[in-house]
């Protein structure tokens, strides 16, 4: 199945001629970004992308790695290093305050430094840091957050919160001596502490007082508000703008996004978290993909620019369950919403980023055959006589011993979109990895994303590039907000 | 409202065929996987076969004990769900019941069930 | 492929009683069981899903509890019309159901 002009030297000199040739006409443009964009594929290692980029391929009946996602597009790269300050291997919230706010931070903390610890409140007070997004807020730009988790979740939330918890996602969350001591849920701090545009994602039961129905399931006790202060968070939230509408659904979502009265739009399509793409009921929920686009249209129509953050958050879901064709199909979505974007965007005044907020310990070896399946058996056996899959996990669910021995595996079940990949030690949930992360950029200012940085570098070039604080003196052409 | 209603079942020789089928309505058919279970006379419920969404190419899977014999298929334009029954056996006999999953908590729990097709295998 | 044993599969019990149903998975189902309630020439009706959540509608009297292999489905306080056959349900690989539990008032 090895395409026989492969087996031509002439393929491979004509392809990295052509390259090359791309990149000598790259030309750092010293023009300031007029908008932002960060796009974040939640736990989206450089083993997810290589795996995804097959997989995205093979879904178009091609080999897999020829193919190109379009992150890969992006002419810009660097590596970052995700540490948090207490934990060689981070969580999303530590991550958050990184690359949103340009400041380390403790493990399970978000939009605080490191001086804060987790689950005192009394220690967040003086250590809040600011997150880019606020930032181009106060410079008079429109800003905007887009999820697949709850909108309250960890990255997000690194847009807009200060938190000693990341799990305090409303006020039932958070412990009596906490709210005694002045500390905020995350909901609560998603409508006060700044003005977001838009925000669309998941995380309806948040917003509304305890007994409240949720609207898609009603009869869900499960499902509805969970707030104890009895605040409707939508409805106050709705009373601060005069062209604020709330959606729930994808029908409203798509109405909203085309009607010029519209100035702030709040979009929370799931109790909780927002469902698998593949779980995903087209006619109730809005894709990724969709999301961005109506984010972009309202933000778009600021002549000032605007700040977007994209989250493909369900990434992480899917390798925390050691279930990669979820963990993989998500980032296809991820790298659908990228392309998009791209669409409605122009790379003259948009700086675009991409990147992951930490790795998993997600492998993909074993020498498989050019062509075949992502979700397939590595040719031969193990040790043990038994097939054995070429995606794995370090650690995770996916461990089972069946008599004392590692179960057999076959291509049928590899491939199922339920089949959790073995793993060689067994956890509940498998973890975050260590190692550094890509960052692909692509716009003005994309070509200070190089070498090897730190995750809080993300954060500064955004600022820069659209001259916010504290590079407001950035001395680029045209200055930001000129265009009004 | 979800409704799933079978139809098809009846009295067949061993040996012959036959073909189910659960029509779907009060929902996106095309974004939900559906399956097929079987009770015996006075005995307990079994898994038969179930085929995926749209999104996951509408793949198949089936147990152990009907694998070979029996097909699941789909028809989206028609919101119907089919069981081609092959070869059946006295054995086969049994109410055949057709579900659709939901995805809570994002597993494919069955929350919604037909009323039930009796299939009886005998000469 | 998974299997569950569900015990006992039968079992009386006087109105007011607490009743408990267990179910064991042949491996690790990751909190992936729904339990339901079967009445004579009745479809299945779903109780409770992912271990412990109430399904709409249904009494709190019945409540799941459990992770990795081992389950168990109560019936606080057990009422004439909770009379049927109770089966447990793995869907973390596939679908796989318990023996069943028939539940007699004494």
């Known amino acids: 199945i090895i395409p026989v002009e492969e087996e031509n030297p002439d393929f491979w000199n004509r392809q990295a001629a052509e390259a090359l040739g791309a990149a000598k006409k790259l030309q750092p443009a010293q023009t300031a970004a007029k908008n932002l964009i960060i796009f974040l594929g939640d736990g989206m290692g450089v083993s997810t992308v290589t795996a995804a980029r097959i997989l995205k391929g093979q879904k178009k009946d091609k080999l897999g790695p020829e193919t190109f996602l379009a992150m890969d597009r992006f002419p810009y790269v660097a590596l970052s290093k995700t540490y948090s300050v207490d934990k060689h291997v981070p969580d999303s919230g530590a991550t958050a305050t990184a690359y949103l706010c340009g400041v380390k931070g403790n493990f399970q903390t978000i939009g605080l430094s490191a001086a804060a610890r987790f689950n005192q409140c009394n220690t967040t007070r003086g250590n809040e840091v600011i997150s880019v997004m606020n930032r181009a807020k106060k410079a008079g730009k429109s800003v905007g957050v887009v999820t697949t988790t709850r909108v309250q979740h960890a990255s997000p939330a690194g847009a807009y919160a200060h938190t000693v918890n990341r799990n305090w996602y409303s006020d039932a969350d958070v412990p009596a001596s906490a709210r005694q001591e002045g500390c905020q849920d995350i909901a609560t701090q998603l409508i006060s502490n700044m003005d977001i545009d838009v925000i669309l994602g998941g995380g309806r039961k948040y917003m509304f007082p305890m007994g409240t129905p949720d609207p898609e399931y009603p009869d869900d006790y499960s499902q509805g508000g969970t707030r104890l202060d009895g605040k409707n968070l939508v409805q106050e939230w709705l009373a601060k703008h005069q062209g604020a509408r709330y959606v729930w659904n994808r029908t409203e979502l798509l109405q909203a996004s085309l009607d010029p009265s519209v100035t702030h739009l709040m979009g929370l399509f799931e109790p909780g978290d927002m469902k698998y793409e593949i779980h995903r009921d087209s006619t109730l929920d809005p894709s990724l993909m969709e999301m961005t686009e109506a984010a972009l249209l309202l933000l778009s129509r600021n002549p000032r620019g605007f700040f977007l953050f994209v989250e493909g958050g369900r990434i992480d879901h899917g390798h925390h369950e050691s279930r990669a064709y979820r963990a993989l199909t998500e980032t296809i979505m991820f790298d659908d919403a990228i392309e998009r974007a791209g669409q409605l965007t122009s790379e003259e005044d948009t700086l675009s980023l991409v990147t992951a907020d930490h790795s998993h310990v997600f492998s993909f070896g074993g020498y498989p055959l050019r062509g075949s399946s992502i979700f397939g058996l590595a040719p031969g056996k193990a040790r043990d006589r038994k097939a054995y899959t070429v995606l794995l996990y370090g650690n995770g669910p996916g461990y089972v011993l069946k008599d004392g021995a590692r179960p057999d595996v076959t291509e049928s079940e590899s491939g199922s979109p339920e089949y959790r990949q073995q793993s060689a030690v067994p956890l509940d949930g498998e973890t975050h990895a260590g190692e550094d992360v890509a960052v692909f950029a692509r716009g003005p200012q994309a070509h200070l994303v190089h070498g090897v940085q730190e995750q809080t570098f993300i954060a500064h070039v955004m600022a820069f590039a659209a001259c916010l604080e504290p590079y407001t003196a950035c001395d680029l052409a045209p200055r930001a907000g000129t265009t009004d | 409202e979800v409704q799933l209603v079978e139809s098809g079942g009846g009295l067949v020789q061993p040996g012959r065929s036959l073909r189910l089928s659960c029509t779907a309505s009060?929902?996106?058919?095309?974004?939900?996987?559906m399956s097929w279970f079987r009770q015996a006379p006075g005995k307990g419920l079994e898994w038969l076969a179930l085929?995926?969404?749209?999104?996951?190419?509408?793949?198949?899977e089936y147990s152990a004990s009907v694998k070979g014999r029996f097909t699941i298929s789909r028809d989206n334009s028609k919101s119907i769900a089919y069981l081609q029954m092959n070869s059946l056996k006295t054995e086969d006999t049994a109410v055949y019941y057709c579900?659709?999953?939901?995805?809570?908590?994002?597993?494919?729990?069955?929350?919604?069930w037909g009323q039930g097709t009796l299939v009886t295998v005998s000469s | 492929d998974t299997q569950m044993t569900q015990s006992p599969s039968s079992l009386s019990a006087s109105v007011g009683d607490r009743v408990t149903i267990t179910c064991k998975a042949s491996q690790d189902i990751n909190k992936y069981i729904a339990w339901y309630q079967q009445k004579p020439g009745k479809a299945p009706k779903l109780l409770i899903h992912?271990?412990?959540t109430l399904q709409p509608g249904v009494p709190s009297r019945f409540s799941g509890s459990g992770s990795g292999r081992d389950y168990t489905f109560t019936i606080s306080s057990l009422q004439p019309e909770d009379i049927a056959t109770y089966y447990c349900?793995?869907?973390?690989?596939?679908?796989?159901f318990g023996q069943g539990t028939k539940l007699e008032i004494k």
């Open positions: 009060g929902f996106t058919f095309t974004d939900y996987y």
């Open positions: 579900t659709r999953a939901s995805f809570y908590y994002d597993g494919k729990v069955l929350a919604y």
């Open positions: 992912y271990t412990s």
């Open positions: 085929i995926r969404n749209k999104a996951t190419g509408y793949t198949t």
């Open positions: 349900l793995q869907y973390d690989n596939l679908y796989t």
